[in-house]
């Protein structure tokens, strides 16, 4: 070996200085008598080496690196050899930090594996090989006096936890536990824990199960779940408290917590839930009142709450067939009485014959919002209910009676916008209990079965805004019927458009007769079109050769017009404008020439 490096310390604090010397022996005959020693850190040449010849003929170079900022690097001592750099010796330098104090040391006792598992946070990176050791001792008191030492627990590389097996534990007796971290730059120790392994016991959670329905037990109420749990047998003798958490399977709801529950409440009815909803449930337990750790949450149990009978008001309306008055068409609408009013599976219309106690005859059972049935001759009323698997809504009586109440007056309708109509009226005296408003297409598309209807519960209302099934350019028939205690008033109707179309074209003008100073014009009116409002008037316009304009307004029933006061032998442009409430349209232009003074008049 020609050269040898020695360093002040091969491992230093990151950023600290380091001093190195390189000695080249004299007997390296192939070297220059006065070789220049160079220093290289990693790939970079380092200036600042101080070189001297020693008394024994060896050459020495000393360099001080003011800050070692690499966590690992090779320092080389080199000579120029021809055109290349010859490395004579190199050393590995390392830089880093002494270990920080390990923190957040915590332990839990696992009764299944019979071991005490401790974990900690090692602190920031030291950049140096650092070993951690979990150290412990048995103590009779509060860890002030140290008893028998327990074998050190050394975690696997890179792990920040370690298991102390049961043979080194004493339950119901305190242990002192701490973590020691060590590297080349120093040693640190975590604060000491003093604990009884049983006080950090982490139990296994119970297993949640659905309760087997027993014939004598009442079924759960709507919005309730009956469940039970099977405790983890090995922890059965440990007093515990438990908590349950639940959330609906659908939606973004967060977990709701129920507790504390004693472990021994092996069966439980959980209420206040949404009816007919699938829930996910979990349970966990903790040693209590003595100290311990919460168990993990149990595997999920998925259960569905029973539904509740529908809580709805049924608004009803009916019509008799004109050809067969005993055939009744009954319509209804469910109005929820609560936020969660229960699912509706279907509807039943039934009749109870008088004198037949308990006998109820179903007239129809449907999922629709209407049904048609033959009303028995002695039946004056029927009952309507909504139902689901949990039961029925309160029956709504429907009384079939003649129209004996007073009629409303001044029924009128007006467009609000292209998709709504306002219908107004003057209420009769006495006030009705409410009104039924029906609407549908008027003639020629009118149909009784396609009508929409609404119940207005306020008998003092003087109008109603129709917003459903209203389209522009359609004629609607609107029928309003006042409702009284046991009867109704006569129905009134009115027709209206929510938006009408302007006439699509005006009639063509034809010249019938012409003279020197007059011209007789005629036209054939356009037939009325559905969705177009009737014409209100015509306006006829004429313009002479000097661009002077004249006009006359004619009523909508006009079929012709005579222009007077024209100039002889003059050119005129004439057109007709047909107007309705929705707008106006012009006809094509008719051009004509009046006769010369000497010419004979044309008829």
């Amino acid at each position: 070996e020609c050269g040898h490096i020695s360093v002040s310390a091969p491992i230093v604090h990151l950023g600290d200085p380091i001093t190195a010397s390189c000695i080249i022996k004299q007997n390296c005959s192939h070297l220059d008598p006065e070789p220049q020693i160079l220093w290289r850190l990693g790939a970079e040449l380092q200036p600042g080496g101080r070189q001297q010849r020693l008394s024994d003929g060896t050459q020495e170079s000393i360099i001080t690196l003011p800050h070692l900022n690499h966590t690992q690097a090779f320092l080389s001592c080199c000579l120029n050899w021809g055109n290349s750099l010859q490395i004579l010796d190199q050393v590995e330098l390392r830089a880093g930090y002494p270990p920080a104090i390990p923190h957040n040391l915590s332990c839990l006792m696992n009764l299944t594996t019979s071991s005490l598992i401790c974990q900690w946070e090692p602190g920031p990176e030291t950049h140096l090989p650092t070993s951690f050791t979990l150290k412990s001792f048995k103590s009779r008191g509060n860890c002030q006096t140290q008893g028998d030492s327990i074998l050190d627990c050394v975690p696997k590389d890179g792990q920040s936890h370690c298991c102390i097996p049961r043979k080194h534990l004493l339950l119901y007796q305190n242990m002192g536990i701490w973590v020691q971290a060590e590297n080349a730059l120093g040693t640190s120790m975590s604060p000491q824990l003093c604990l009884d392994p049983m006080d950090v016991v982490k139990l296994e959670p119970p297993m949640l199960r659905t309760m087997d329905p027993s014939p004598e037990a009442a079924p759960p109420q709507a919005g309730c779940l009956q469940l039970c749990w099977e405790p983890w047998q090995p922890g059965l003798h440990i007093n515990q408290k438990c908590e349950l958490r639940h959330k609906p399977q659908r939606g973004e709801a967060s977990w709701a917590l129920v507790g504390p529950l004693p472990l021994e409440a092996l069966q439980y009815e959980l209420c206040g839930l949404l009816p007919a909803t699938a829930y996910t449930l979990q349970i966990r337990c903790i040693r209590w009142p003595l100290p311990g750790h919460w168990s993990d949450w149990s595997p999920s149990l998925e259960l569905r709450t029973t539904e509740r009978a529908p809580t709805v008001r049924l608004d009803t309306w009916w019509r008799q067939r004109q050809l067969d008055p005993r055939t009744v068409q009954l319509f209804w609408k469910p109005v929820p009485l609560e936020e969660d009013s229960g699912r509706i599976q279907g509807y039943v219309v039934s009749w109870r014959p008088s004198g037949q106690a308990g006998a109820i005859l179903p007239l129809c059972n449907t999922t629709e919002l209407s049904c048609t049935f033959h009303l028995p001759s002695e039946a004056q009323e029927v009952a309507l209910v909504a139902y689901n698997s949990a039961g029925t809504s309160r029956p709504t009586p429907v009384v079939f009676s003649e129209s004996r109440g007073p009629a409303l007056t001044r029924l009128h309708a007006m467009a609000r916008d292209p998709h709504s109509l306002w219908v107004g009226w003057e209420p009769p005296n006495p006030w009705p209990q409410g009104y039924v408003i029906e609407w549908g297409l008027g003639p020629p598309s009118a149909s009784n079965s396609n009508k929409t209807w609404r119940m207005e519960q306020n008998g003092r209302a003087t109008g109603f805004l129709l917003k459903e099934n209203i389209r522009p350019f359609q004629l609607y028939e609107i029928i309003v019927t006042p409702l009284y205690q046991d009867t109704m008033g006569p129905s009134q109707h009115v027709y209206a458009y929510s938006q009408e179309m302007a006439p699509s074209h005006a009639p063509e003008l034809h010249l019938k007769h012409i003279g020197k100073t007059w011209a007789q014009l005629e036209w054939v009116p356009e037939p009325p079109e559905l969705g177009k409002s009737p014409l209100t008037h015509y306006t006829i316009f004429w313009t002479n050769a000097q661009n002077q304009s004249f006009s006359a307004i004619l009523n909508a029933s006009s079929r012709g017009f005579v222009l007077h006061g024209l100039e002889p032998a003059s050119l005129y442009h004439i057109h007709l404008m047909a107007a309705s409430q929705a707008g106006a349209t012009n006809s094509t232009v008719l051009t004509l020439m009046t006769l010369t003074p000497e010419g004979s008049e044309l008829h």
Epitope: L111, T112, T113, S114, R166, K167, L171, M198, P231, Q233, P234, L236, H237, I238, N239, P262, E264, A265, L266, R287, P289
Partner: antibody, heavy 118, light 107 residues
Framework: EVQLLESGGGLVQPGGSLRLSCAAS????????MGWVRQAPGKGLEWVSS????????PYADSVKGRFTISRDNSKNTLYLQMNSLRAEDTAVYYC???????????WGQGTLVTVSS | DIQMTQSPSSLSASVGDRVTITCRAS??????LNWYQQKPGKAPKLLIY???NLQNGVPSRFSGSGSGTDFTLTISSLQPEDFATYYC?????????FGGGTKVEIK
């Protein structure tokens, strides 16, 4: 000092009934599981039944299920064993025991002898 | 049910001897194994719980080991007062079960 004192043993005919009591002192009775263990003359130990701290959980040995009922009165610090339909094979010394958190029987009473014979 | 098999059923030993009694469970019971000592006409007394934990007041010559299915009670140096019957008991799950007992007699 923990003390468990059994009483209620004696001679009873087959098919008859007996009620054993165990008076506990020296610890917070309501916090611990309790149990009954029996030992037939010249035989080994046999667990009979246990009861949780509040009385909600009561496991039984198959040999006594449906005939024996374990109960407790936390206000009186007393454990009971109601024995019905007694058989000759139920003849034994009955011990009352205080259970630890890991199911160990930490303290035992001195025992009471039950003899079932005609 | 979990069966507990104790062996030997009896043994003769002298004062100062090291005595070992084994207990085998028919299925894994983790560390839920307890040892009791019973002297004639007396109630049993807890020696070791949870396989290896010495009950307060019990001399340190008694020790327990094992886990899963195989367990051992060791008396490191038999004393005159140790001649008795020893029982193991599992408390892993109900029904709790005892071993048949090992009678330690004076040689």
């Amino acid at each position: 000092e923990v003390q468990l004192l059994e009483s209620g043993g004696g001679l009873v005919q087959p098919g008859g009934s007996l009620r054993l009591s165990c008076a506990a002192s020296g610890f917070t009775f309501s916090l611990y599981w309790m149990g009954w263990v029996r030992q037939a003359p010249g035989k080994g130990l046999e667990w009979v039944s246990s009861i949780s701290s509040s009385g909600g959980v009561t496991p039984y040995a198959d040999s006594v299920k449906g005939r024996f009922t374990i109960s407790r009165d936390n206000s009186k610090n007393t454990l009971y064993l109601q024995m019905n339909s007694l058989r000759a094979e139920d003849t034994a010394v009955y011990y009352c025991a205080k259970l630890g958190e890991l199911g160990q029987m930490v303290y035992w009473g001195q025992g009471t002898l039950v003899t079932v014979s005609s | 049910d979990i069966q507990m098999t104790q062996s030997p059923s009896s043994l003769s030993a002298s004062v100062g001897d090291r005595v070992t009694i084994t207990c085998r469970a028919s299925q894994g019971i983790s560390s839920y194994l307890n040892w009791y000592q019973q002297k004639p006409g007396k109630a049993p007394k807890l020696l070791i719980y949870y396989a290896s934990n010495l009950q307060n007041g019990v001399p340190s010559r008694f020790s327990g080991s094992g886990s899963g299915t195989d367990f051992t009670l060791t008396i490191s140096s038999l004393q005159p007062e140790d001649f008795a019957t020893y029982y193991c008991q599992q408390s892993f799950k109900y029904p709790m079960t005892f071993g048949g007992g090992t009678k330690v007699e004076i040689k």
